[in-house]
Structures are given as structure tokens and as C-alpha cells.
């Protein structure tokens, strides 16, 4: 029999390299049975996760899974960091693994790193 617990399917150590000034949607895959749980996003600041209250979010429903989406309209350099989604379900708090956004910023050609550096770990050069 399939479990009817709420499950959040963010993979351990998941990460996204994204470009400042571009739109981006961060998805929290949510599996639930009957009633859709209340889901929130927070951003890690040291050991605490600060709830993102004033950010645009939406639900996307698919056949076997739903997605709670955090919208970046657009991505800003200070969006760099780790995020977590949490679901309240029957008085229980279920937390996802954290997912990390590496925000890359366009630099002028004179500041360009070497090709090898950029190809291997581009985000480190633009934090």
C-alpha cells in the first residue's frame, strides 16, 4: 500500500547555476494524497532558515506529483545561496533537503577568467 505521508522530492545536494537578470523558477516537488499541504520556502542563513514571506509562489499540478514553485522575477546576485521547502501536514513539519542556487553575473570581457576556470566552475567567479 502506498504511503499517504507528504513527501518532498528535492534531491540531496541539488544545485542550479543561474544567471542574474534572467527569470527562474525553483521547484519543490510535492507528493500528497488527499488534501494539499501548506508549503513554504525559506533561505538558509547559517543554521537558521529564514522564511520567504513576500515572494511570488505558485502551484503546478501534474498527474502524479505537484510542484510548489518559488519565482525569481528576475534572479538577483543576492539570491545566491541555499533554499529549502517545508510542508505542514497533520501538525507535522516536513522539511526538504536544501537546494543551492549559484548565481552567475555577467562580467566585462576585461575581467574574464581563464577558459579552463570558467568551464569547470563558473559560479565561483561571480559571487
Amino acid at each position: 500500500k502506498e504511503s499517504c505521508d507528504v513527501q518532498l522530492y528535492i534531491k540531496r545536494q541539488s544545485e542550479h547555476s543561474i544567471l542574474a537578470g534572467d527569470p527562474f523558477e525553483l521547484e519543490c516537488p510535492v507528493k500528497y494524497c488527499a488534501n494539499r499541504p501548506h508549503v513554504t520556502w525559506c533561505k538558509l542563513n547559517g543554521t537558521t532558515c529564514v522564511k520567504l514571506e513576500d515572494r511570488q509562489t505558485s502551484w503546478k499540478e501534474e498527474k502524479n506529483i505537484s510542484f510548489f514553485i518559488l519565482h525569481f522575477e528576475p534572479v538577483l546576485p543576492n539570491d545566491n545561496g541555499s533554499y529549502r521547502c517545508s510542508a505542514n501536514f497533520q501538525s507535522n513539519l516536513i522539511e526538504s533537503h536544501s537546494t543551492t542556487l549559484y548565481v552567475t553575473d555577467v562580467k566585462s570581457a576585461s575581467e574574464r577568467p581563464s577558459k579552463d576556470e570558467m568551464a569547470s566552475r563558473p559560479w565561483l567567479l561571480y559571487r
Epitope: S17, I18, L19, P23, F24, V106, A119, P122
Partner: antibody, heavy 115, light 114 residues
Framework: EVQLVESGGGLVQPGGSLRLSCAAS????????IQWVRQAPGKGLEWVGF???????YYASRAKGRFTISRDDSKNSLYLQMNSLKTEDTAVYYC?????????WGQGTLVTVSS | DIQMTQSPSSLSASVGDRVTITCQAS??????LSWYQQKPGKAPKLLIY???TLASGVPSRFSGSGSGTDFTFTISSLQPEDIATYYC????????????????FGGGTKVEIK
């Protein structure tokens, strides 16, 4: 409704100038990277350049020195000023929101360079 | 300068077939690659960005993979509405703030139904 609308295309003689506009609605154009892409009749896509959210413009070498991308935040619009036009600049010109994640495109405006 | 080589330039497949298009960069572009679909008379539509991330609202039959210089775009089960031309685009030059003498778009692949 979130959209981009290009305008300003038309017929121009070789050596002439034209200014294309890209008007945004439903979002603040100044916060985004916006790229210009063109497509000659029956050909593939060709990158022209882009302006980043900080206002810095970058160009393909074929456009450098002849084309200028600018922004008017008060009009929520972007412009492509094209000078010294050549017959090979004949194309549909598109503006698109985002560089890596270009999720929104205009319908395009046709520029014909011919004598 | 980065050159993008896309192949094949055209292909014909049956409804339900798996379709694969490749794009090769002349130097490493990490994962800064997008894939677009364009139908006649219409603007391009983003399908995949960052090599493998499905754009919002795009059916899951479309997928992308690869990094460095070699990239693949796949339609797992071709549908009649997928008839279009598909393009890859390297956004690496924009990311590092350089520009290229070459076009960061591949030459396109026209997909037709058998």
C-alpha cells in the same frame, strides 16, 4: 499580460539607419537581461547582442560599431539603433527576455535593406 | 571564438519515434546551452536551458543532456505538433561578457513526419 512587442521595422536603403523598439508590458524591463536575435528570410537564427540588467550592452562582432542597444526605463522599452545598414542585415528582428533562460519573445519586426 | 555545430540539418521520423539532435561546441561552454523550437512564421520557443533544465510548461517528452562540448536534445516520442525547426544556442559568451565572431546558434534541425 506579460509580453514584448517589437516595432520600427520597414524598408531602408543600404547605408541608412533604423531604430527598432521593444516595448515590455507586465514586467519591469530594467530588471532583466534582454537579447536581440535576428533571422534572415529562410535562414537560421543569428544573435545580435544583449543588454544586461545593469545596463551594459554586449554585441556580436557583426553588429559592433554599427548597432547600439539602449533602454528607456521610464517607457519600459528597449531599443536597437542600427546604422550603416547593409543588404545582409535584412531579417526579422526579435527581442527576448533573459539570456540563458529566454522565456519570453516578441513577435518580431521585419527590416528590409534594399535600394 | 565558439562555433556551434548542430546535426543533422534535417530528419524525418514517424509519430512515436525517439528523435535525437546533437550540438557540438568548438570549446567548452560548461552547461550554458539552450534549445529552442521554431514553427514557420513564429518566434522561437524555449524548451531547455542550462543544457538539461526543462523550461516552464514544456512537455516532459523533451529533454536535454551534455556538458562541456557535446550536447544532445531528445524527443522521447515524436508528436505531430513537434514538427518544427530546432536550434541550440550557447549562452557562454554572454555569461563571460565576451562576444564572438561566430553565431552562438547552431544551424538548426528541421524535423518532419514520415
Amino acid at each position: 499580460e506579460v509580453q514584448l512587442v517589437e516595432s520600427g521595422g520597414g524598408l531602408v536603403q543600404p547605408g541608412g539607419s533604423l531604430r527598432l523598439s521593444c516595448a515590455a508590458s507586465g514586467f519591469d524591463i530594467s530588471k532583466y537581461n534582454i537579447q536581440w536575435v535576428r533571422q534572415a528570410p529562410g535562414k537560421g537564427l543569428e544573435w545580435v547582442g544583449f543588454i544586461n540588467y545593469g545596463g551594459s550592452a554586449y554585441y556580436a562582432s557583426r553588429a559592433k560599431g554599427r548597432f547600439t542597444i539602449s533602454r528607456d526605463d521610464s517607457k519600459n522599452s528597449l531599443y536597437l539603433q542600427m546604422n550603416s545598414l547593409k543588404t545582409e542585415d535584412t531579417a526579422v528582428y526579435y527581442c527576448a527576455r533573459g539570456l540563458s533562460n529566454s522565456d519570453l519573445w516578441g513577435q518580431g519586426t521585419l527590416v528590409t535593406v534594399s535600394s | 571564438d565558439i562555433q556551434m555545430t548542430q546535426s543533422p540539418s534535417s530528419l524525418s521520423a514517424s509519430v512515436g519515434d525517439r528523435v535525437t539532435i546533437t550540438c557540438q561546441a568548438s570549446q567548452s561552454i560548461s552547461s550554458w546551452l539552450s534549445w529552442y523550437q521554431q514553427k514557420p512564421g513564429k518566434a522561437p520557443k524555449l524548451l531547455i536551458y542550462r543544457a538539461s533544465t526543462l523550461a516552464s510548461g514544456v512537455p516532459s517528452r523533451f529533454s536535454g543532456s551534455g556538458s562541456g562540448t557535446d550536447f544532445t536534445f531528445t524527443i522521447s516520442s515524436l508528436q505531430p505538433e513537434d514538427i518544427a525547426t530546432y536550434y541550440c544556442q550557447s549562452t557562454y559568451g554572454g555569461v563571460v561578457g565576451s562576444t564572438s565572431d561566430d553565431n552562438p546558434f547552431g544551424g538548426g534541425t528541421k524535423v518532419e513526419i514520415k
